[in-house]
């Protein structure tokens, strides 16, 4: 089972950690999938990005995903581990000046083109069972993740335990 | 301050088996994932057994895959190592460590001054 | 599998020498990479993690730099206390250590 402890405990530091840095610590290219090995594609429709979960014809390209990844800094207060309360967070760019953001109040998961510093909702705290089976929280909003419902990706509420073995909230990160 | 003290090793004979402790202090201990890594008289560093913050889910090295179980006792801020059908390949000094983030398995950020394992008849 | 192969095995250098550690794996690993310091008699220490970040507290004569398949960890100017043994660690898929460079002085 894939699970991922502390949910509540850290809502109120979740919400108060900061970036440390302005730049990101490392940075690579890698295509996303889903568990279940659906792809993750990105289209340019009428000038906005969609975003769609969808089996590959054999030969068909991956699209690829810029991931920044960016330490943050929990306050000692709130982690009990001084300075050592780090967390990874990440943001998703699968083309230029565009980024995954988490809208919350509509559940869902868009590409909105915007400049640096980018707002808080394109950022994820990286989770993982493996180096490449992964899942993202929002920083805006602790125990939402970005999951997949109907062939979209969605945020979806993870409120306990047991839900947190879900396959529709991890997904593949790969070179090809 | 963040530390990690191991306990539980010693020689034992071919065969039999061993329990190695790892009690963490100094961090919040649930939100981190925790390992084993031996080390070999002499010899480089194994990475032997990895365990995500809630337990869930277990790594091994393939050579001790069957014999070796971790497992963690949140509660207790305790990370263990059951070591069975000990071989004489196992003798090593092991260490426990922390991950270096909250969530992932990225990185040793601290290790424990290690427990000697002697495996011989 | 992932293999990590560092070179030299043994690098002797003089006080105040620019020296560099080389680590190659057999497949990309997009700098999911560390390095430890390992002292005689000591546990390991965290030096760099995700090839070129230093960890707190660690001299800023330590640097790395690498991507895909290939890694260095520099030491501007040797100095004694830096004597020891160096791993490269991969994360990137499952977990492996290279097998060490035993830097010496002169």
């Known amino acids: 089972a894939f699970g991922i402890s502390g949910v509540q405990k850290y809502t109120r530091a979740l919400h108060d950690s900061s970036i440390t840095g302005i730049s990101p610590i490392t940075e690579y290219l890698a295509s996303l999938s889903t568990y279940n090995d659906q792809s993750i594609t990105f289209a340019l429709e009428d000038e906005s990005y969609e975003i769609y979960v969808e089996d590959l014809k054999k030969d068909e390209k991956k699209d690829k995903v810029l991931l920044s990844y960016y330490e943050s800094q929990h306050p000692s207060n709130e982690s009990g581990d001084g300075v050592d309360g780090k967390m990874l967070m990440v943001t998703l760019s699968p083309t230029k000046d565009f980024w995954l953001h988490a809208n919350n109040k509509e559940h869902s998961v868009e590409l909105h083109k915007c400049e640096k510093p980018l707002p808080d909702q394109a950022f994820f705290v990286l989770h993982n069972m493996h180096s490449n089976c992964v899942s993202f929280e929002c920083k805006t909003d602790p125990g939402v993740f970005i999951g997949v419902k109907d062939n979209h990706l969605a945020l979806i509420k993870v409120d306990s335990s047991e839900n947190l073995c879900t396959e529709n909230i991890l997904f593949k990160l790969s070179e090809t | 301050e963040v530390q990690l003290v191991e306990t539980g090793g010693g020689l034992v004979q071919p065969g039999r088996s061993l329990k190695l402790s790892c009690v963490a202090s100094?961090?919040?201990?649930?939100?981190?994932?925790m390992y084993w890594i031996r080390q070999a008289p002499g010899m480089g560093l194994e990475w032997v057994s990895s365990?995500?913050?809630?337990?869930?889910?277990?790594y091994y090295l393939d050579s001790v895959k069957g014999r070796f179980t971790i497992s963690r006792n949140n509660a207790e801020n305790t990370v263990y190592l059951q070591m069975n059908s000990l071989r004489s390949e196992d003798t090593a000094t092991y260490y426990c460590a922390k991950g270096h983030y909250y969530y992932t398995s990225y990185s040793f950020a601290y290790w424990g001054q290690g427990t000697l394992v002697t495996v011989s008849s | 599998d992932i293999q990590m192969t560092q070179s030299p095995s043994v690098l002797s250098a003089s006080v105040g020498d620019r020296v560099t550690l080389s680590c190659k794996a057999s497949h990309n690993i997009n700098k999911h990479l560390d390095w430890y310091q390992q002292k005689v008699g000591e546990a390991p220490k965290l030096l760099i993690y995700?090839?070129?970040n230093l960890q707190t507290g660690i001299p800023s004569r330590f640097s790395g730099s690498g991507s895909g398949t290939d890694y260095t960890l520099t030491i501007s100017s040797l100095q004694p206390e830096d004597v020891a043994t160096y791993f490269c660690f991969q994360y990137n898929s499952g977990w492996t250590f290279g097998q060490g460079t035993k830097v010496e002085i002169k």
């Open positions: 995700f090839t070129n």
């Open positions: 365990i995500n913050n809630d337990g869930g889910n277990t």
């Open positions: 100094g961090f919040t201990f649930s939100n981190y994932w």
